[in-house]
Amino acid sequence: GYKAEVMVSQVYSGSLRVLNRHFSQDLTRRESSAFRSETAKAQKMLKELITSTRLGTYYNSSSVYSFGEGPLTCFFWFILQIPEHRRLMLSPEVVQALLVEELLSTVNSSAAVPYRAEYEVDPEGLVILEASVKDIAALNSTLGCYRYSYVGQGQVLRLKGPDHLASSCLWHLQGPKDLMLKLRLEWTLAECRDRLAMYDVAGPLEKRLITSVYGCSRQEPVVEVLASGAIMAVVWKKGLHSYYDPFVLSVQPVVFQACEVNLTLDNRLDSQGVLSTPYFPSYYSPQTHCSWHLTVPSLDYGLALWFDAYALRRQKYDLPCTQGQWTIQNRRLCGLRILQPYAERIPVVATAGITINFTSQISLTGPGVRVHYGLYNQSDPCPGEFLCSVNGLCVPACDGVKDCPNGLDERNCVCRATFQCKEDSTCISLPKVCDGQPDCLNGSDEEQCQEGVPCGTFTFQCEDRSCVKKPNPQCDGRPDCRDGSDEEHCDCGLQGPSSRIVGGAVSSEGEWPWQASLQVRGRHICGGALIADRWVITAAHCFQEDSMASTVLWTVFLGKVWQNSRWPGEVSFKVSRLLLHPYHEEDSHDYDVALLQLDHPVVRSAAVRPVCLPARSHFFEPGLHCWITGWGALREGGPISNALQKVDVQLIPQDLCSEVYRYQVTPRMLCAGYRKGKKDACQGDSGGPLVCKALSGRWFLAGLVSWGLGCGRPNYFGVYTRITGVISWIQQVVT
C-alpha cells in the first residue's frame, strides 16, 4: 500500500550582508518602527531567496531577528521541512552553496529578481549554520531583553547589566572584521545562581557554545573568553532575584595572535620557558591552532612539558578531544583538566626536533593552557628521586608516602623513611644522620656532613641549589649550607616566655604565639597559624560555603588565649586577600590549605610570632609527638572551648593511616592522633596548626587540622594537611 513519506524539520541559522543599506542605532531597538519595517523587508527577501532555489519546495518558515554593522548584516533562522532520507544531503554547507550559487547567478542579471528588489546581498557574506528547534526556542526566550553592541578597534565596552524583570537576556556582540572578540566576565557577588553562556555566533546555538559559567564561581572570579572571530553572543539566565548585578561584562576586539614558535633549547636541565595559548589566561578560542617546534641540543636529553592542572591522555576510538587536542611526534593526545600537576616526557630520538600541535577540536573551549618546557636527562630523568610514570613527575622515593598514584615510589625500598648505611644496608633513623655520633658500622652516616652531596629525598636544598646530607638542618643554630641559607629566615618558631581539642589542656599566654583565631561577626570559626608578617595559613575548607567566601567577613585575631575576653597582647586584623590552593578539592579534602593576607603587617611580640615553615625535604618522623592547638569543641558535637586548648598527638605512618581510612588519604595529608582516640582535633579547630619541636627548640608547622571521622574516636586518627606537600605553593604566594 501507499506509505506517506516521513518529513523532518531541519533548522538553519545564519547571517547575510546587505551592501546597499546601512546599519543605524534604531535597528537595535526591537520596538522601533525602523526595526519593524526593516524586519518585514528583510524577511520577505530571505523567503524569496530560499524559494528561488530548489530548497523552495521544502520551505517552512523563517525569521530575521536582528541587525548589525557591515554595512548592514541581517541575522536570521529558517526551517525546511524535508524528507527524512534527504536530511544528510541538505547539510548547512550544501544549503549555503545553493543560496550562494543563486545569488551569484543573478549578480549581473538584468532580469527582475524578487529578492533583489530592495537589497543587494553580498554572496561572500552569507553564512549558514546548523541549528535546532531548541536553539530557536532559546533565542526567542531572550528577545524581550536583546542587546546588540558593536565594539570598535581599541575600544573596551562595558555592557549594560541584564534587565532583572526578564528571566533571560542576550548580548549580541560584533567587532571589526578580521579581529576576534575577547569577553571579560567578573563576578561581583559572593553568591548567586545566575548562568551565563557564551557562543561563537550571533545566537544561542548549542553546537557553537564556547563555555557556560554558573553561580558566581569562586574558583574563577574572573573569566576571559575569546571568540574565533568578530561575532559573539552571551546569554544570561536569571538565578535568585537580586537588585544588584552579580557580574560585570566587558568586551574588546583583539588581533589574532600567532601561535607558532621555533625554539632551540639550551644545554641545561629544568624549565627553560613557557608556551601558552593566545591571550593566556583567557580561554583559548574555538579554531585555535598552535604549532611549537622545539629543537633539543643533544640526544642525551628528552623534552619535558610541565602542565598545571591539565594532563594529556590517550583518547580511545578517535573521539574528539573536548579539552584540546595535542599531537606530539604523531601521537594524538587529549587534554584533560585535573586538580593535580602533570608532566609529559618526550624521549628524543632524532636531532630534527619535536613538533607539538595544539588544536581546539570543537567550539567548546576552556581555560587557556600554559606549559613550561625544559630538558631532562634521558638516562637519569629524576636524579635522587623516582620518576612516576603515571603523571611524569619526579617524586621522593622511599620516604613513607606514596606520592605516585600506583605507589611504585614506595616499592622495593631497602630502607623506607630511614637512612641506608653504605656498609651493610642496615637502616637507621634519619635524626641519627650527621648528629656527630656514628651509628652505621663504619660510620657512613657521619660522612660528607660538611660538604655538598647529590640531592635526594631527604637532603636539604640550599639557596645556591647545592644539597646537604644532614636532615632538617633549618634554623638549628649552625650553618650547614656553604651559603648559610639553612640559617636564614629563622626568626620563627620560638614560644613566648610562659610557664578544641579533645583530651587537651589549657594553654598559657605566649605559649603558641602563632595561633590565630579566624572569626566571622565575633564568632570563632576556624584556627590558623601566622607564618609571615602579613600571612596566616589555614584550611581551605573553612571557606567552603559561599557565604564564607568574602574577605570582608573575616577578622583574624593573634595573641589570643581566651575567646570571651581580651588581654593586652591580643591584636586583630582584617583580611585583604584570601587565596585557596588552586588544586583544593572539597569532596576529597585534598590540598586543604588557604592563605590569608592581613591588612597590615604584624608587630612581633612575646604573644605574636610566626611558626617556622619546613622545607619540602623536612622529615617529620612517624612516631614523633607533636602538638595541636585550638578552641574547637571539647567533645564531639559540643560547643567551642573558651580557652585555647593544646594536646600532644603522635605522627602516624602514611600507609597505616591510609588503610584505616580505606585509602582516602592522599600524599598531601598527614595523620596524627592516638589509636585509642581520646586525643584529637575537633570542630572549630579546623585550619589550626599541628606543630613539632625540632632539636633546636624551634617549632615547625607540620600540618593543618583538616578532617577526620568524628573527634577522638577510637580507631580513627585526625587527618591534617601535610605542609611539606604544599610548601612550594605557600612559598610562591608569600614571597
Epitope: S429, G623, Q650, E659, R675, K676, P714, N715, F717
Partner: antibody, heavy 120, light 110 residues
Framework: QVQLVESGGGVVQPGRSLRLSCAAS????????MDWVRQAPGRGLEWVAL????????YYADSVKGRFTISRDNSKNTLYLQMNSLRGEDTAVYFC?????????????WGQGTLVTVSS | QSVLTQPPSVSEAPRQRVTISCSGS????????VNWYQQLPGKAPKLLIS???VVSSGVSDRFSGSKSGTSASLAISGLQSADEADYYC???????????FGGGTKLTVL
C-alpha cells in the same frame, strides 16, 4: 631491626623484690609507649603495665596495682619493671612490648621474655 | 576468667578456612580497636592484625580481621601446618583502664 631484650629475671622468694629491664634499639624509643605483658606457664597472655612515651602516664592491671612500678629512662633507651611483694601467682615469663603507632593497645614488637619464678 | 572470650581450640584440614571468634562488651571491643596475635610454641607473640582489620607488614594476606559490635573475628584461609599456634585477641578496656586479652585459641591443622 627493632630489638627488645629483657633481663633481670630469676628465682625469688615470695615477698621479695625484683627489677626487670628491657633494652630497646632500632627505633626512637622516646616516641613510643611501652608495656609489660606476662605469661604464666601453660597459660594465656596477661597484660601487666603500660607507660606513656614521656613517662607521664602509667597504667597497671588490678592484679599488680600497688606492688609493681613501671618506669623508663629515655636517655638509656631502657624500660623497667620494679616488682615488690612478689607472690607465687606472679611466676611467669615477662615480655616487654612496644606499642604500635597511636599507642595504648597494639604491641607490634615483643622481646623474647625473661622468666621470673617466685618460690620459697 | 578472661575479659574477652575465645574458643579454647579450633581445628581444620589443610587448605581450608577457619574463623576464630572473640567476644567482649561495649567498654572494650565495642569502643576500641581489636588486635590479633599469633604465638608459636616457645616463642614470643607476633602481631598479625591491628585496627580490627589492618594486616601487619610481613604477615600473609591469608589472615584477615573483622569486627561487628562487641565481637571480632580472625579468619585464616588456605590453612598450612605452619599456622598451628595459639591465637590471642586483645583490646583496650575503658572501664579497667588497661589492655585485656582473650584466653587464647589453640589452632590445630589436621
Amino acid at each position: 631491626q627493632v630489638q627488645l631484650v629483657e633481663s633481670g629475671g630469676g628465682v625469688v622468694q615470695p615477698g621479695r623484690s625484683l627489677r626487670l629491664s628491657c633494652a630497646a634499639s632500632g627505633f626512637t624509643f622516646s616516641n613510643f609507649d611501652m608495656d609489660w605483658v606476662r605469661q604464666a606457664p601453660g597459660r594465656g597472655l596477661e597484660w601487666v603495665a603500660l607507660i606513656s612515651y614521656d613517662g607521664s602516664k602509667k597504667y597497671y592491671a588490678d592484679s599488680v596495682k600497688g606492688r609493681f612500678t613501671i618506669s623508663r629512662d629515655n636517655s638509656k633507651n631502657t624500660l623497667y619493671l620494679q616488682m615488690n611483694s612478689l607472690r607465687g601467682e606472679d611466676t611467669a615469663v615477662y615480655f616487654c612490648a612496644k606499642e604500635g603507632y597511636g599507642g595504648y593497645d597494639g604491641f607490634d614488637y615483643w622481646g623474647q621474655g625473661t622468666l621470673v619464678t617466685v618460690s620459697s | 576468667q578472661s575479659v574477652l572470650t575465645q574458643p579454647p581450640s579450633v581445628s581444620e584440614a589443610p587448605r581450608q578456612r577457619v574463623t576464630i571468634s572473640c567476644s567482649g562488651s561495649t567498654s572494650n571491643i565495642g569502643n576500641n580497636a581489636v588486635n590479633w596475635y599469633q604465638q608459636l610454641p616457645g616463642k614470643a607473640p607476633k602481631l598479625l592484625i591491628s585496627y580490627d582489620y589492618v594486616v601487619s607488614s610481613g604477615v600473609s594476606d591469608r589472615f584477615s580481621g573483622s569486627k561487628s559490635g562487641t565481637s571480632a573475628s580472625l579468619a585464616i584461609s588456605g590453612l598450612q601446618s605452619a599456622d598451628e599456634a595459639d591465637y590471642y585477641c586483645s583490646t583496650w578496656d575503658d572501664g579497667l583502664n588497661g589492655v585485656v586479652f582473650g584466653g587464647g585459641t589453640k589452632l590445630t591443622v589436621l
